[in-house]
């Protein structure tokens, strides 16, 4: 660090004074020197180091007519917003010829009310759930003692006697405010007031009660909500593609969820208008006057298969001697599951009904008994899934086939009631 030499008398006729004050203070240090000839540039030192970017001014006043006469030089250093880093010993420095001169030191100190480095923040917490709040303050002067207040009531008998930087709260059952006071020899500073909003706990044990192809009934156990009754719960369901990848804790589904509200109690909800035989993910959150709980994790569920909702379409049945040829198309109505096959039933006027499982084929040739003289033969077809048979088609009469004639096609409507057949007995 530059040092003044004693070979010549110091040119300084005014030295920096002292400033002590609170953070944010605007202050000015001054030094004055009298020199002969060209006035030098005045530099400022803090703790022996030159301040390269000092906010300083310089005035030069000649004391005579000639440039070689004496000059008075005044330099002022501005401290705009006093911080801890500004404190220290300040001096002016000039280079005159081959010599360096430094003024007597002035001192800048920080002393005032405590200053908060950290204050309690607003937050939401679940009812009866532990959490921590932070507060940190410094002087000078030190020491700084903290006093926590909850709803404006001190949590200790005196500053410094209770928790200091961190306040552990074992749980709240109502929305509360917290602040901290910082005390030092200069007085007291009060932090901002943090509002801790008590929300319901996350619901637990979300589970399926019953399943239908297009609806699921779900139930859950509500969490504690403090002094605030639950007003409703919200259930979300989202289609889960195999590759969708909703993880247990993933915050949001990849598509817009189906949202339903449930009055509570009971903590149960029937989710309708779902697709059969479809995987979903569901979650629930419950709300009080203070706001909603966090969502439960996504629960994978699946609607069961249903039976097809309509009969096969465009059934045609033609007879040629002792053979009957029957074909049809897949039902237009929703299958509500995976199509496993078709059942076919045929019956004559005075003969017992014959029931066949055709599998996934959409045509069959029937070998009729005897000479084929069975009268008024009719055929019915139904599609089935793992959940059972769909509705049977209306009976289609077997028509005699004549060469050169197109096979007749019957447009059939849905059978209102399904015949009760047992499993094939053949």
């Amino acid at each position: 660090a530059p040092r003044g030499t004693q070979a010549e008398e110091s040119p300084f006729v005014g030295n920096p004074g002292n400033i002590t004050g609170a953070r944010g203070l605007t202050g000015t240090l001054r030094c004055q020197l009298q020199v002969q000839g060209e006035p030098p540039e005045v530099h400022w030192l803090r703790d022996g180091q030159i301040l390269e970017l000092a906010d300083s001014t310089q005035t030069q006043v000649p004391l005579g007519e000639d440039e070689q006469d004496d000059w008075i030089v005044v330099s002022q250093l501005r401290i705009t917003s006093l911080q801890l880093s500004d404190t220290g010993q300040y001096q002016c420095l000039v280079f005159l010829g081959h010599q360096t001169f430094v003024s007597q030191p002035g001192y800048v100190g920080l002393e005032g009310l405590p200053y908060f480095l950290e204050e309690p923040e607003d937050r939401t917490v679940a009812a009866n759930t532990p959490f921590n709040l932070s507060c940190q303050a410094q002087g000078p002067p030190e020491p700084v003692d903290l006093l926590w207040l909850q709803d404006a009531v001190p949590l200790a008998t005196a500053p410094g006697h209770g928790p200091q930087r961190s306040l552990h709260v074992p749980g709240l059952n109502k929305t509360s405010s917290f602040s901290c006071e910082a005390h030092n020899a200069k007085g007291v500073t009060t932090s901002r007031t943090a509002t801790i909003t008590v929300l319901p706990q996350q619901p637990r044990n979300l589970h399926l009660v019953s399943r239908q192809p297009t609806e699921l009934e779900v139930a859950w156990t509500p969490g504690l909500s403090g002094i605030y009754p639950l007003t409703h719960c919200t259930l979300q369901a989202v289609l889960s593609d195999d590759g969708m990848g909703i993880q247990a804790g993933e915050p949001d589904p990849p598509e817009e969820p189906l949202t339903s509200q449930a009055s509570v109690p009971p903590h149960q909800l029937r989710l309708g208008s779902l697709h059969p035989h479809t995987p979903y993910h569901i979650r629930v959150a419950c709300t009080s006057s203070q706001g909603p709980s966090s969502w439960t994790h996504w629960l994978p569920v699946e609607t069961p298969e249903g039976v097809p909702l309509g009969p096969p379409e465009n059934i045609s049945a033609t007879r040629n001697g002792s053979q009957a040829f029957v074909h049809w198309q897949e039902p237009r109505a929703p299958l509500q599951g995976t199509l496993l096959g078709y059942r076919l039933a045929y019956q004559g006027q005075d003969t017992p009904e014959v029931l066949m499982d055709i599998g996934l084929r959409q045509e069959v040739t029937l070998e009729l008994q005897g000479d084929g003289s069975v009268s008024n033969l009719t055929v019915c077809v139904a599609a089935y899934t793992a959940a059972g048979d769909g509705p049977w088609s209306l009976p289609v009469p077997l028509e005699a086939w004549r060469p050169g004639q197109a096979q007749p096609v019957h447009q059939l409507v849905k059978e209102p009631s399904t015949p009760a057949f047992s499993w094939p007995w053949w």
Epitope: G14, G17, G21, T26, G27, T28, C31, T57, T59, V74
Partner: antibody
């Protein structure tokens, strides 16, 4: 004799720009901080900003930060206030003022001892 | 920012009266307070700096006092040329802020 003379005021549309000048005489601009203060019609005084002409450092009120720029030319002994993106609420008489320099070794705060006559924007 | 609250906002007085204007800071500003006088259509004039120091050329009937948050400007014997608006200003922190002004009128 110490004197500050403002010029450059006038009528301008919202969103427009204006440059005010503050010509100093009787003292060197390098030796003090120069402040700009404004006064809306029938209202009180509002500080706009200051400049250290010797270093070129400027400091602004939040209400003008990013829109106004204070500069100085020590060779012309003149300070400037460049006002851009002007708003209706910037309507005022604008004064430049010299900061009073005491002769003690230190001081806390400051006062403004010489003021210009003001220019209406 | 520090708020400076002046009172009263206006007062009526007669020549020769003793007039007191007060200014309260929203937080401690030590002695970093100045007082100015402004007449209509004119620039402000410095009267007092550092709370209690009389600026050069200002008549001695003007005086200032106070420290911390409460400050006072006193005119010991009001003269005809003293009818004007008076402003306090703190410069302890930046930005400096002014009081809203006190208008001294002739009774």
């Amino acid at each position: 004799e110490v004197q500050l003379v403002e010029s450059g005021g006038g009528l301008v549309q919202p969103g427009g720009s204006l440059r005010l000048s503050c010509a100093a005489s009787g003292f060197s601009l390098s030796g003090s901080w120069i402040h700009w203060v404004r006064q809306a019609p029938g209202k009180g005084l509002e500080w706009v900003g200051w400049i250290n002409p010797y270093r070129g450092y400027a400091y602004y009120a939040d209400s003008v930060k990013g829109r106004f720029t204070i500069s100085a030319d020590t060779s012309k002994n003149t300070a400037y206030l460049q006002m851009n993106s002007l708003r209706a609420e910037d309507t005022a008489v604008y004064y430049c003022a010299r900061e009073y320099s005491g002769w003690g070794g230190s001081s806390v705060g400051y006062a403004m001892d010489y003021w210009g006559q003001g220019t209406l924007v | 920012d520090i708020q400076m609250t002046q009172s009263p906002s206006s007062l009526s007085a007669s020549v020769g009266d003793r007039v007191t204007i007060t200014c309260r800071a929203s937080q401690d500003v030590s002695t970093a307070v100045a007082w100015y006088q402004q007449k209509p259509g004119k620039a402000p004039k410095l009267l007092i700096y550092s709370a209690s120091f009389l600026y050069s050329g200002v008549p001695s009937r003007f005086s200032g006092s106070g420290s911390g948050t409460d400050f006072t400007l006193t005119i010991s014997s009001l003269q005809p040329e003293d009818f004007a608006t008076y402003y306090c200003q703190q410069s302890y922190t930046t930005p400096p802020t002014f009081g809203q002004g006190t208008k001294v009128e002739i009774k």
